[in-house]
């Protein structure tokens, strides 16, 4: 039979490191994490660490019982967790039957957004007491909230991740500028700004019509030249406060009639939360 | 049955380069390290290096990292072997030889002569 | 690189004498060591593996033992077939390493 993993949590020190081994398994070849989605129970999805790894091929591998799996996670707080994962049989062959080096995963490390994981392994048993023995590390960096699969977990949705604002803005003089967007029954509270190296324009806008989504129009007085600028609209939505994804647009010159003209190249960007 | 077919005996001059192949049967290819070690005349036997056909991952003997190249065409489940810059003293049997398990050889190629001499 | 000496370099024995050849490494290598036979203008062939485990159709008066860095070949009564050169190597991680021969000749 070939070998297989049986993984199980392990925070403490391996009980092997107490022990004097003559010799230690050699080291991994390969250790590599990304990220996979599972749906949970309550309509909304998880992502998950996969991480994989590959053993060096070498009578070395008959030594190894288990490989252990220790992740740091750094954001707002720190975490860290490790997993040990034994092998089920003893190796008879040094790369697998079929071809190729052994390979192993382990899917079950949660993964929050916009987190720095350190992920590191060793073969067990390791290396003594106060000597260094044979590990690999990786970091592995989550997404936010504009990424393709994050943006529709739940806590993204609420930060605006699937809302289009389709923001126009036109110059309607020297010293206005006129912005339309769409809003979201998310929030009712925006901030538009005018940009041009510095700000040079701004406005709050209070959409009372939450529950709809709505045309909003706002004017917003200028203090330089506004062609060409960016304008950045702000949502404040309850889940994220004033780190909400922030939509982008350019500022033209308004048609004769004072119809905004409409943008295709409208692009979205975090804000410092990115959930 | 597990065979390893090597190719005819060369003679080469000082300088040159010589290429030894190794065609397989008898099992999956992919699935055993492929090593090649030589013996000069009257001499012991020599590790060269190995390579996984499955993915070419190559280890060589230090001795002659800088000289020999390892290659696999899966497509007709041969090796290759190619030491290049000979000398005199690269005259030896050159063989191929694999296992199932560990690196012990239990099936080895029939041996290249290569000679060399000006 | 693990070192690999065998001994004695060349022996002279009759058809049913008891032979050994002592192979010692310089470091432990777990038993992770073979012994092969080879005849002039052949390839060698597998002995046993592992120490101690015989090679497909190896006959049973070949054994080996030995464990850490010293290991030892066998041939419980020598015949006519058996005479020729052996090797021991250790398979213990590249670069694997043959121990130096032993040349085994009629007496």
């Known amino acids: 039979r070939e070998p297989t993993v049986q993984c199980g949590s392990e925070t403490g020190p391996s009980p092997e490191w107490m022990l004097q081994h003559d010799l230690i398994p050699g080291d991994l070849r390969d250790l590599r994490v990304e990220p996979v989605t599972t749906s949970v129970a309550t309509g909304d999805y998880s992502i998950l660490m996969n991480v994989s790894w590959v053993l060096r091929a070498d009578a070395s591998i008959r030594l190894l019982k288990a490989t252990k799996i220790c992740v740091t996670g750094k954001s707002n707080f720190q975490s860290y967790s490790c997993v040990r994962c034994n092998y089920t049989e003893a190796f008879q062959t040094q790369t697998r039957p079929s071809g190729g080096k052994w390979t192993f995963s382990y899917i079950g490390f949660p993964v929050e957004l916009n987190t720095v994981y350190f992920i590191g392994a060793h073969n067990i048993p390791n290396a003594n007491m106060n000597e260094d023995g044979p590990s690999m590390s990786v970091n592995f960096t989550s997404p936010g909230c504009l990424d393709h699969i994050m943006k529709y977990k739940k806590k993204c949705v609420k930060a605006g991740s699937l809302w289009d604002p389709n923001i126009t803005a036109c110059k309607k003089n020297e010293e206005t500028v006129e912005v339309n967007f769409t809003t979201t029954p998310l929030g009712n509270r925006y901030m538009a700004l005018i940009q041009h190296s510095t700000i040079i324009g701004f406005s709050q806008v209070f959409e009372p019509h939450q529950k709809k989504q709505t045309r909003a129009s706002v004017v917003i007085p200028v203090t330089g030249d506004s062609e060409g600028a960016t304008v950045q609209l702000t949502p404040y939505f309850p889940t994220c406060g004033s780190d909400c994804i922030r939509h982008k647009g350019t500022v033209v010159l308004c048609p004769q009639t004072g119809v905004p003209f409409p943008l295709d190249n409208n692009k979205s960007k975090p804000g410092g939360w990115l959930p | 049955e597990v065979q390893l077919v090597q190719s005819g005996a060369e003679v080469k001059k000082p300088g040159a380069s010589v290429k030894v192949s190794c065609k397989t049967s008898g099992y999956t290819f992919i699935s055993y390290w492929m090593n090649w070690v030589r013996q000069a005349p009257g001499q012991g036997l020599e590790w060269m290096g190995r390579i996984d056909p499955y993915d070419s991952e190559i280890q060589y003997n230090q001795k002659f990292k800088d000289r020999v190249t390892l290659t696999v065409d899966t497509s007709i489940s041969t090796a290759y072997m190619e030491l290049s810059r000979l000398r005199s003293d690269d005259t030896a049997v050159y063989y191929c030889a694999t296992s199932g398990g560990f690196d012990w050889f239990a099936y080895w190629g029939q041996g290249t002569l290569v000679t060399v001499s000006s | 690189d693990i070192q690999m000496t065998q001994s004695p370099s060349s022996l002279s024995a009759s058809v049913g004498d008891r032979v050994t050849i002592t192979c010692r490494t310089s470091e432990n290598i777990y038993s992770n060591l073979a012994w092969y036979q080879q005849k002039p203008g052949k390839a060698p062939k597998l002995l046993l593996y592992?120490?101690?485990n015989l090679g497909d159709g190896v006959p049973s008066r070949f054994s080996g033992s030995g464990s850490g860095t010293d290991y030892t070949l066998t041939i419980s009564s020598l015949q006519p077939e058996d005479f020729a050169t052996y090797y021991c190597?250790?398979?213990?991680?590249?670069?694997?390493?043959f121990g130096g021969g032993t040349k085994v000749e009629i007496k």
């Open positions: 190597q250790h398979f213990w991680g590249p670069p694997y390493t």
């Open positions: 592992d120490a101690t």
